[in-house]
Interface confidence: low
């Protein structure tokens, strides 16, 4: 019969014949022959291959380097790579999460619109009229000014985006 020029899915062409690819989690030891099937071996500890393949070496699991602020989010298997994320208070610098940076803090006058996650930084927003923030924080939202009226007090000093209003007693001399 004519030697094949193309092979089925999960096969590869070598020496004019179709051999089975190794399944995910295994590497190629030897190609098939006219008489033998492809020989595959499982990947070792801390190695993986995530596709049907003819690789002679498995890939090393990614190392989540604590010196770069990384920790393991999901341990790798023989078929999947390790997934890294950042330590508390840090977020990934890229989708691949190869290193981390400290979460940004929102300065006084700004509040946290969205708290940072392992993959995204803090989002800050200016405190609108009626709200304030007097701290630099990665968690604090803008707080509403104190309502003097509900305490039967009057505003003695107006609030700003960085300071609360100052309440004081009612002027008793008014008719």
């Amino acid at each position: 019969p004519e030697p094949p020029t193309a092979c089925r899915e999960k096969q590869y062409l070598i020496n004019s014949q179709c051999c089975s690819l190794c399944q995910p989690g295994q590497k190629l030891v030897s190609d098939c022959t006219e008489f033998t099937e492809t020989e595959c071996l499982p990947c070792g500890e801390s190695e993986f291959l995530d596709t049907w393949n003819r690789e002679t070496h498995c890939h090393q699991h990614k190392y989540c380097d604590p010196n770069l602020g990384l920790r393991v989010q999901q341990k790798g298997t023989s078929e999947t790579d390790t997934i890294c994320t950042c330590e508390e208070g840090w977020h990934c610098t890229s989708e691949a999460c190869e290193s981390c940076v400290l979460h940004r803090s929102c300065s006084p006058g700004f509040g946290v619109k969205q708290i940072a996650t392992g993959v995204s930084d803090t989002i800050c927003e200016p405190c609108p009229v009626g709200f304030f923030s007097n701290v630099s924080s990665a968690f604090e939202k803008c707080h509403p000014w104190t309502s003097c009226e509900t305490k039967d007090l009057v505003v003695q000093q107006a609030g700003t985006n960085k300071t609360d209003v100052v309440c004081g007693p009612q002027d008793r001399l008014r008719a």
């Epitope: 090393q60 190392y63 380097d65 010196n67 770069l68 610098t93 190869e98 290193s99």
Partner: nanobody, 120 residues
Framework: EVQLVESGGALAQPGGSLRLSCEAS????????MAWYRQGPGKPREMVAN???????YYADSVKGRFTLSREGARNTVYLQMNSLKPEDTAVYQC??????????????WGRGTQVTVSS
């Protein structure tokens, strides 16, 4: 064994400038990131800035706009230009090169550190 040699640490006035450099004693292949860390008196070590193999640079908020990181890839040299120095920048600055060794193992080289003191 590759050595990282740091230089440029000194006593500087507040508002002054310094340039730190870190050079590897041999070429390191498969560098993933080069970074400067610092450890101030009584403080934990923190990453100041790092630059990935794709030349993307990241800075800690405390140094953004004041410090600039650059590198010479061929020589595995990384520089930290420090401007508008503040007393709180006082620390031992350590160079770090994060790389993938043969066999795909990710490893680090660390320098011994260079002292930066900001004081009037």
């Amino acid at each position: 064994e590759v050595q990282l040699v740091e230089s440029g640490g000194a006593l500087a006035q507040p508002g002054g400038s310094l340039r730190l450099s870190c050079e590897a004693s041999a070429t390191i292949r498969s560098v993933n990131a080069m970074a400067w860390y610092r450890q101030g008196p009584g403080k934990p070590r923190e990453m100041v800035a790092n630059i990935t193999s794709g030349d993307t640079t990241y800075y800690a908020d405390s140094v953004k706009g004041r410090f600039t990181l650059s590198r010479e890839g061929a020589r595995n040299t990384v520089y930290l230009q420090m401007n508008s120095l503040k007393p709180e920048d006082t620390a031992v600055y350590q160079c770090n090169i994060h790389y993938t060794s043969t066999g795909g193992i990710r490893r680090d080289y660390w320098g011994r550190g260079t002292q930066v003191t900001v004081s009037s």
